[in-house]
């Protein structure tokens, strides 16, 4: 990595956390919908 240690920056970490949160919300919603449809 040409960025060296700076690849693990807080701004990148925050973006990853936001994506994880979004995916968890979407998957959770889908799961609830599936249970409801059953």
């Amino acid at each position: 990595h040409s960025d060296g240690i700076f690849t693990d920056s807080y701004s990148r970490y925050r973006k990853q956390m936001a994506v994880k949160k979004y995916l968890a919300a979407v998957l959770g919603k889908r799961y609830k919908q599936r249970v409801k449809n059953k």
Epitope: G4, I5, F6, T7, D8, S9
Partner: antibody
Framework: QSVEESGGRLVTPGTPLTLTCTVS????????MNWVRQAPGKGLEWIGI??????TYYAPWAKGRFTISKTSSTTVDLKMTSPTTEDTATYFC?????????WGPGTLVTVSS | AQVLTQTPSSVSAAVGGTVTINCQSS????????LSWYQQKPGQPPNFLIY???NLASGVPSRFKGSGSGTQFTLTISDLECDDAATYYC??????????FGGGTEVVVK
């Protein structure tokens, strides 16, 4: 996501000591991990860092005195090769490259004869 | 070696007041912005406040403000609260993959 240090204890001068940083909730394959120390009543002192590719970098004063290594996907070690009384401090592990955004509670190392 | 000089070493202000802490680096930090600020209370690890000179970390009140670039940086705490009494540290990340901390500033709230 958290980090925790372990291995701090009372050692005699010259006795090698290895501290361990255990991470949870993230992988070391995407993280840079630092060791920072703080002598009693003193300020923070950066020792060194291991990046996500296992490359290591040290403060000029720490070269040869400390060795940082990745020992598993969740642990990073700090080896103190030949501690002196001046190495008495709380040793912290912290995640981040160029900034330190997740800290452990620290582990106390006392070097005394 | 890179040196971070923090001034003053101690500062006192009343509740509701403002304090300013300066951090000067002997050479430019990475990208001119890799300067962060931390708050530490006795017996606790440091708490991450500000990253890349001026960005607030998650959960940090907007009373904390970071500014500066290159070699000169400032942390300003406004509307001081009793809970702000602590020691504050700046830290720099350098393009050589080396990092360092300032000497710390003790903030006393009267």
């Amino acid at each position: 996501q958290s980090v925790e240090e372990s291995g701090g204890r009372l050692v005699t001068p010259g006795t090698p000591l290895t501290l361990t940083c255990t991470v949870s909730g993230f992988s070391l394959s995407s993280a840079a991990m630092n060791w920072v120390r703080q002598a009693p009543g003193k300020g923070l002192e950066w020792i060194g860092i291991i990046d996500n590719t296992a490359g290591t970098y040290y403060a000029p004063w720490a070269k040869g005195r400390f060795t940082i290594s990745k020992t598993s996907s969740t642990t990073v070690d700090l080896k103190m090769t030949s501690p002196t009384t001046e190495d008495t401090a709380t040793y912290f592990c912290a995640r981040g490259g160029g900034e330190f955004f997740i800290w452990g509670p620290g582990t106390l190392v006392t070097v005394s004869s | 070696a890179q040196v971070l000089t923090q001034t003053p070493s101690s500062v006192s202000a009343a509740v509701g007041g403002t304090v300013t802490i300066n951090c000067q680096s002997s050479q430019s930090v990475h990208d001119g912005s890799y300067l962060s600020w931390y708050q530490q209370k006795p017996g606790q690890p440091p708490n991450f406040l500000i990253y890349q000179a001026s960005n607030l970390a998650s959960g940090v009140p907007s009373r904390f403000k970071g500014s500066g670039s290159g070699t000169q940086f400032t942390l300003t705490i406004s509307d001081l609260e009793c809970d702000d009494a602590a020691t504050y540290y700046c830290a720099g990340g350098y393009s050589s993959n080396i990092c360092g901390f300032g000497g710390g500033t003790e903030v006393v709230v009267k």
